[in-house]
């Protein structure tokens, strides 16, 4: 079952061959059962095969590993640890594999791992040390550059009594291992808030995707340290207004592009600063598409077309004049 020389073609191993495999390190041209391998492309694909664990006999040449659409359930410590190690593995895609638990040290002994995709797995239990590998206050730096965690929120009945946001952030910050992370995608996770310390500790971020969450406010979030940030996706959240502090921080980032579409902007007196900023800034992509959702009289008005006279707040009545 040797891979062909063409980078675009894959060899797949026959079960009767694989059943003869011993527990010795894999042969250079060996391909695990239920997988397709291309040594030329340094790629192994074990896709939609209902695997319940990571194959032990992955070829040492693998650089790109696709384990999508399986039923892995659990990634234990050292799930990819091999002798000799998978020293070239750079891109690992585990999306849609029914993972609900990722244990401490799951990605240890992968010295070249730069891209990791855990999207579309209901991660009820993401260890704080899943990415750092140890509970030391400062861990060895992770080689990860891209971490894709879109739609990893479990169903409500499977969530613990703790904050899901807190669980994810603990894993991102543990041991300061992800200081080199450049791309972080956290879309579609029902996040209600962004813990204030998370961005400050990921100083290398270039791309941050928080789209399709339930973020109501960025008041306590600081973007000041993210001097390399190039794109910030905040589409499809529950943002009502961006306040002065946030506007100033975003404006101060030299390379930033911000995406704000499909948020329920509240066009009252608190929106005045944001409207003024929108008219002047170049950082917001598609700013002409931003429209008011509230109050009712302002619905669908384009933010860029508003002036200060449009942005009023109903006076707060003293208690004696309020009706029930």
């Amino acid at each position: 079952s040797s891979p062909t020389s063409s980078a675009s073609s894959f060899s797949s191993s026959a079960p009767f061959l694989a059943s003869a495999v011993s527990a010795q390190p894999p042969l250079p041209d060996q391909c695990p059962a239920l997988c397709e391998c291309s040594e030329a492309a340094r790629t192994v694909k074990c896709v939609n095969r209902n695997l319940t664990e990571v194959p032990t006999d992955l070829p040492a040449y693998v650089r790109n590993l696709f384990l999508t659409g399986n039923q892995l359930a659990v990634l234990p410590a050292g799930a990819f640890a091999r002798r000799p190690p998978l020293a070239e593995l750079a891109a690992l895609n585990l999306s849609g594999s029914r993972l609900d638990e990722v244990r401490a040290g799951a990605f240890e002994h992968l010295p070249s791992l730069r891209q990791l995709d855990l999207s579309h797995n209901p991660l009820a239990d993401l260890s704080p040390f899943a990415f750092s590998g140890s509970n030391a206050s400062v861990s060895a730096p992770s080689p990860l550059v891209e971490l894709i965690l879109n739609h990893i929120v479990p169903p409500e009945d499977e969530r613990q009594n703790r904050s899901f946001e807190g669980m994810v952030v603990a894993a991102l910050l543990a041991g300061r291992a992800l200081q080199g992370l450049r791309r972080l995608e956290l879309a579609s996770n029902h996040f209600l808030y962004l813990p204030r310390d998370v961005l400050a500790q990921l100083p290398s971020l270039r791309h941050l995707d928080l789209s399709n969450n339930s973020l109501v406010s960025l008041t306590y979030v600081s973007f000041r340290n993210l001097t390399h940030l190039e794109s910030l996706h905040l589409e499809d959240n529950a943002l009502k207004v961006l306040h002065n502090g946030t506007l100033a921080e975003l404006q101060g980032l030299p390379h930033i592009r911000v995406f704000l579409d499909n948020n329920p902007w509240v066009c009252d007196c608190h929106m005045a600063d944001m409207v003024t900023w929108l008219k002047e800034t170049e950082v917001v992509q598609g700013k002409d598409r931003l429209t008011c959702a509230y109050p009712e009289k302002m619905r669908n008005r384009v933010l860029l077309e508003l002036n200060s006279a449009d942005l009023d707040c109903d006076p707060i009545l003293p208690p004696s004049l309020q009706t029930s």
């Epitope: 495999v21 664990e53 032990t56 410590a77 638990e101 239990d125 613990q160």
Partner: antibody, heavy 120, light 111 residues
């Protein structure tokens, strides 16, 4: 009805080899990981080896590593245990057992067992 | 390796009375969400039979007088009202990591 039937046991001298088989029926064999577990006379249970549904993953107890090899033939619905360099302490009833998923659940079906006696 | 210690080694209980068996692991076999401890019943001359999976989930077809509880390192199998057919040896087993290990067994008899 799920059935697992072991065979291949017997009396063998130390240092010799034996191959056990486990014939599976009543379920889609290729969807399940399989284990061998043994029980020495009058003793408790000892896990021996595991093989994943597609034979891409296998694990062994330290006590048998390098001597025993687990394999399967999904086209024949059969699990095997090749036992080499047998020792007196390998004397036991050997059971094959099925697991729905590697970590999460227990061994939900077991065969009746086959007896291996290593004696000079 | 994770060592599972069962207690007591044997247990004599009157018919209709409660029987409780404990299993302690040398390290945690639970994550914050799941437990990887299972219980088996073995009658003389028969293979083991799965009773409880993942600490507390009753296997299909097992009478509801059997129940399991616990997490971390301490687990319990309870037979709420012992019947004559429950005379057997009971084993705990973890699947947290390789190697899987079994407890030493608890023999349940009728007093």
């Amino acid at each position: 009805e799920v059935q697992l039937v072991e065979s291949g046991g017997g009396v063998v001298q130390p240092g010799r080899s034996l191959r056990l088989s486990c014939a599976a029926s009543g379920f889609t064999f290729s969807n399940f990981g399989m284990h061998w577990v043994r029980q020495a006379p009058g003793k408790g249970l000892e896990w021996v080896a595991y093989i994943s549904s597609g034979s891409s993953t296998f694990y062994y107890a330290d006590s048998v590593k390098g001597r025993f090899t687990i394999s399967r033939d999904n086209s024949k619905n059969t699990l095997y245990l090749q036992m080499n360099s047998l020792r007196a302490e390998d004397t036991a009833v050997y059971y094959c057992a099925r697991s729905p998923a590697y970590y999460r659940y227990g061994l939900d079906y077991w065969g009746q067992g086959t007896t291996v006696t290593v004696s000079s | 390796d994770i060592v599972l210690t069962q207690s007591p080694d044997s247990l004599a209980v009157s018919l209709g009375e409660r029987a409780t068996i404990n299993c302690r692991a040398s390290q945690s076999v639970s994550s914050s969400t799941f437990s990887y401890m299972h219980w088996y019943q073995q009658k003389p001359g028969q293979p083991p039979k799965l009773l409880i999976k993942s600490s507390s989930n009753l296997e299909s077809g097992v009478p509801d007088r059997f129940s399991g509880s616990g997490s971390g390192t301490d687990f319990t199998l309870t037979i709420s009202s012992l019947q004559a057919e429950d005379v057997a040896v009971y084993y705990c087993q973890h699947s947290w990591e390789i190697p899987y290990t079994f407890g030493g067994g608890t023999k349940v008899e009728i007093k």
